[in-house]
Interface confidence: medium
C-alpha cells in the first residue's frame, strides 16, 4: 500500500493543501485512496510511513511575523484531529520572496478509516510547480 | 533492494552530483547499482522510496538571484528525463556563505533499467563533508 | 520493527538530544527499544531507514558563527561513534529568534545491539512544541 | 588569534617515516577541514593532503598518495601527517593550513585562510 | 593552475595577477621570502580575511581568478601563489607563483 500526490493550486480559503493524482503520482490499490482532493485514507490498520515535502516563498515584509509552518495531521474515524509532524520556517527577506522548503516524514500506526492531510499556515505561499509540493504515504 | 551513497566532490561542470560507494554506504545487492558515480539504477520493477539530502553554502551577493534547486529525476529507458522531486531554498546573507540543507524524499514506480539522479543549480556549493549530502532508494 | 519517539526538554548539557515514548508515538515491539532516552537501539541486524526531524529556533547574533547542525550517529557494540548524516542551516537574522527545521533521513545497515541518536550544536534552540522534533526508524 | 604549530620536522633518511604534528588553537578547531601543504627548497607550494572537520575524509597529493596518512584528534586540537617511504625530493618545509569555511570540505586549496609556521623537513642519507 | 611568473608595477599602481585552470575557488597567498610562512589575502574567490588591508580583492569569472592590489606599496614586493581546485585528482592544487616587483 502506498501513495505519493501532487500539490494543486486551490482558491479555496482553507489552510489544508489540495492534491490530485496527476504528474508521475503513486497509488498502488485501493486499499489507500485521495478523499476530496485533500486527504490519503487507508482501509487497512497498520505501520505507516508518512512523509510531506512543501515548497513555499515568502517575504517577511509581507507576512506575518509568525513563521511559516507546515503540519501533518491525522483524522481517526471519531476522534479529534491531531498534529503528527510539523515543521516552521522563518520568512526569507529576499524580495519578491524567497522560496524554501520543508519536509516532513515519520512512522505512524493508523487504524482502519484514518485520514492524514497537511496544513499549512498560508496555502497562497506554496509553489506547485513540477515536484515542489508533494505528500505520500506507505505501509511498513 | 537498497542503496545509500555519498557525495563526491567533482569539478566537472555538469550540475548532475557525483556519488560515490565510500565511507558507511549501502548496496544491498546487485539488483541497485550505481553507474557512473551518478546515478543510481534498479533492475526490478516496482515501487521505491527515493530519498536525497543536499547541504549547501552559499551566499546570497555571489550567487544568482535564482534559489539554490535540488532536483531528484528519472532516466527510464527510451523515455525523456523527468523530474520527480525539486526542493528550492533561497541563498544565505551569512558571509563567507551560510550553509542550508534539503531533504527530498517520495515513493515512485520505477521500471526494470530505470535511474535515478540528483541535480542541482550550483554543484561548486554543495558540502561533501561527512554526512552531509547522499542518496539512496528502497524498494517496498 | 518500528519506532517514532517524540524530543523531550532536557536541562541536561548534553549535545545528545532526549526523546520519550508520549504523545503519538510508535514502538512497536522490544525489538526496538529506547534507552536513557537518548538512544534507539536494536536487537536485530539488517536494513533500516532512519530518520530525524528537529525545529530550531536561533537568532545570528545571539548564536555562535557556525551553523545549527544536527547529526545522526551511530553507536556499534566494541566500536567508536560514527556520523550517518548531517544537516546544517545557518542562524535566521529574525528576533527574538527565527524557526527553521531540518531532517534526515537514510538506509543503514544495524549491527545486533547498534544504538542510534541525534546530536545538535545546541539543544536549547530546539524546539519541543507538538510535532516540531522527533526521531524514528523502520526496519525494511 | 588563529595559531596553527607544527612540529615533527628534522633530518630523515630515505625509507624511513616521519610524523608532523599541528596543534591548532584560537578557533573551534573541530568545524574546519584542515590541509597540510609543503614547499621544496626554492619551489612553490604542493597540496599534501586534507581532512574534513571530524576526520571521516580524507585525500592526498598525487606525489604522497599511497605512502602519506592525514588524521585528526578533535579531543586535542591536532592534525597529524604520517609519511613512509621517504624519498629525497620529499625535503622542504611542511605547512598546516586551516580551511575558511565551517564544515565544508573539499580538499580544496582555495579555501585556506591560515598557516602555521612551517617545519623543515630533510631526507637525506 | 596557470599564473604568471612576473609583473611589477610603480607604487600607486593598480595590479592585477590572473589563475586559471582550477575548477572550485580560488585563494591568494603571499610569500614575502621562500621558507617564511604564506599569508592569506584572499580565500574562497573573494573573501578577505579581517587583518588584510582593503587593497587586496579577489574576483572569479568563470574559471579564471584575479588578485587586484589597489595602491601597490614597496612592502607588497613578494611571490603571490594561487590555490584551488584539480577536477582530475579531487585534490588541492597551487599555481607556480607569481613575483610581484615594485619599482
Known amino acids: 500500500i502506498a501513495a505519493h500526490v501532487i500539490s494543486e493550486a486551490s482558491s479555496k480559503t482553507t489552510s489544508v493543501l489540495q492534491w490530485a493524482e496527476k504528474g508521475y503520482y503513486t497509488m498502488s490499490n485501493n486499499l489507500v485512496t485521495l478523499e476530496n482532493g485533500k486527504q490519503l485514507t487507508v482501509k487497512r490498520q497498520g505501520l505507516y510511513y508518512i512523509y510531506a515535502q512543501v515548497t513555499f516563498c515568502s517575504n517577511r515584509e509581507a507576512s506575518s511575523q509568525a513563521p511559516f509552518i507546515a503540519s501533518l495531521c491525522l483524522k481517526s474515524p471519531g476522534r479529534f484531529e491531531r498534529i503528527l509532524l510539523r515543521a516552521a520556517n522563518t520568512h526569507s527577506s529576499a524580495k519578491p520572496c524567497g522560496q524554501q522548503s520543508i519536509h516532513l516524514g515519520g512512522v505512524f500506526e493508523l487504524q482502519p478509516g484514518a485520514s492524514v492531510f497537511v496544513n499549512v499556515t498560508d496555502p497562497s505561499q506554496v509553489s506547485h510547480g513540477t515536484g515542489f509540493t508533494s505528500f505520500g504515504l506507505l505501509k511498513l | 533492494i537498497a542503496a545509500h551513497v555519498i557525495s563526491e566532490a567533482s569539478s566537472k561542470t555538469t550540475s548532475v552530483l557525483q556519488w560515490a560507494e565510500k565511507g558507511y554506504y549501502t548496496m544491498s545487492n546487485n539488483l541497485v547499482t550505481l553507474e557512473n558515480g551518478k546515478q543510481l539504477t534498479v533492475k526490478r520493477q516496482g515501487l521505491y522510496y527515493i530519498y536525497a539530502q543536499v547541504t549547501f553554502c552559499s551566499n546570497r551577493e555571489a550567487s544568482s538571484q535564482a534559489p539554490f534547486i535540488a532536483s531528484l529525476c528519472l532516466k527510464s529507458p527510451g523515455r525523456f528525463e523527468r523530474i520527480l522531486l525539486r526542493a528550492a531554498n533561497t541563498h544565505s546573507s551569512a558571509k563567507p556563505c551560510g550553509q542550508q540543507s534539503i531533504h527530498l524524499g517520495g515513493v515512485f514506480e520505477l521500471q526494470p533499467g530505470a535511474s535515478v539522479f540528483v541535480n542541482v543549480t550550483d554543484p561548486s556549493q554543495v558540502s561533501h563533508g561527512t554526512g552531509f549530502t547522499s542518496f539512496g532508494l528502497l524498494k517496498l | 520493527i518500528a519506532a517514532h519517539v517524540i524530543s523531550e526538554a532536557s536541562s541536561k548539557t548534553t549535545s545528545v538530544l532526549q526523546w520519550a515514548e508520549k504523545g503519538y508515538y510508535t514502538m512497536s515491539n522490544n525489538l526496538v527499544t529506547l534507552e536513557n532516552g537518548k538512544q534507539l537501539t536494536v536487537k536485530r541486524q539488517g536494513l533500516y531507514y532512519i530518520y530525524a526531524q528537529v525545529t530550531f529556533c536561533s537568532n545570528r547574533e545571539a548564536s555562535s558563527q557556525a551553523p545549527f547542525i544536527a547529526s545522526l550517529c551511530l553507536k556499534s557494540p566494541g566500536r567508536f561513534e560514527r556520523i550517518l548524516l548531517r544537516a546544517a542551516n545557518t542562524h535566521s537574522s529574525a528576533k527574538p529568534c527565527g524557526q527553521q527545521s531540518i531532517h534526515l533521513g537514510g538506509v543503514f545497515e544495524l549491527q545486533p545491539g547498534a544504538s542510534v541518536f541525534v546530536n545538535v550544536t545546541d539543544p536549547s534552540q530546539v524546539s519541543h512544541g507538538t510535532g516540531f522534533t522527533s526521531f524514528g526508524l523502520l526496519k525494511l | 588569534a588563529v595559531t596553527l604549530d607544527e612540529s615533527g620536522g628534522g633530518l630523515h633518511t630515505p625509507g624511513g617515516a616521519l610524523s608532523l604534528v599541528c596543534k591548532a588553537s584560537?578557533?573551534?578547531?573541530?568545524?574546519?577541514?584542515m590541509q597540510w601543504v609543503r614547499q621544496a627548497p626554492g619551489k612553490g607550494l604542493e597540496f599534501v593532503a586534507a581532512?574534513?572537520?571530524?576526520?571521516?575524509?580524507?585525500n592526498y597529493g598525487a606525489a604522497v598518495k599511497g605512502r602519506a596518512t592525514i588524521s585528526r584528534d578533535n579531543g586535542q586540537s591536532t592534525v597529524r601527517l604520517q609519511l613512509n617511504n621517504l624519498r629525497a625530493e620529499d625535503t622542504g618545509t611542511y605547512y598546516c593550513?586551516?580551511?575558511?569555511?565551517?564544515?565544508?570540505?573539499?580538499?580544496?586549496?582555495?579555501?585556506?585562510?591560515?598557516w602555521g609556521h612551517g617545519t623543515e623537513v630533510i631526507v637525506s642519507s | 593552475l596557470t599564473q604568471p611568473s612576473s609583473v611589477s608595477a610603480n607604487p600607486g599602481e593598480t595590479v592585477k595577477i590572473t589563475c586559471s585552470g582550477g575548477?572550485?575557488?580560488y585563494g591568494w597567498y603571499q610569500q614575502k621570502s621562500p621558507g617564511s610562512a604564506p599569508v592569506t589575502l584572499i580565500?574562497?574567490?573573494?573573501e578577505r580575511p579581517s587583518d588584510i588591508p582593503s587593497r587586496f580583492s579577489g574576483s572569479k569569472s568563470g574559471s579564471t581568478a584575479t588578485l587586484t592590489i589597489t595602491g601597490v606599496q614597496a612592502e607588497d614586493e613578494a611571490v603571490y601563489f594561487c590555490?584551488?581546485?584539480?577536477?582530475?585528482?579531487?585534490?588541492?592544487?597551487f599555481g607556480a607563483g607569481t613575483t610581484l616587483t615594485v619599482l
Open positions: 580565500y574562497w574567490d573573494d
Open positions: 575548477s572550485g575557488s
Open positions: 590555490g584551488g581546485y584539480d577536477d582530475s585528482s579531487y585534490a588541492g592544487i
Open positions: 593550513a586551516k580551511d575558511g569555511i565551517i564544515y565544508y570540505w573539499n580538499a580544496d586549496a582555495g579555501y585556506i585562510d591560515a
Open positions: 581532512i574534513d572537520d571530524d576526520g571521516s575524509s580524507t
Open positions: 584560537g578557533f573551534t578547531f573541530s568545524s574546519y577541514g
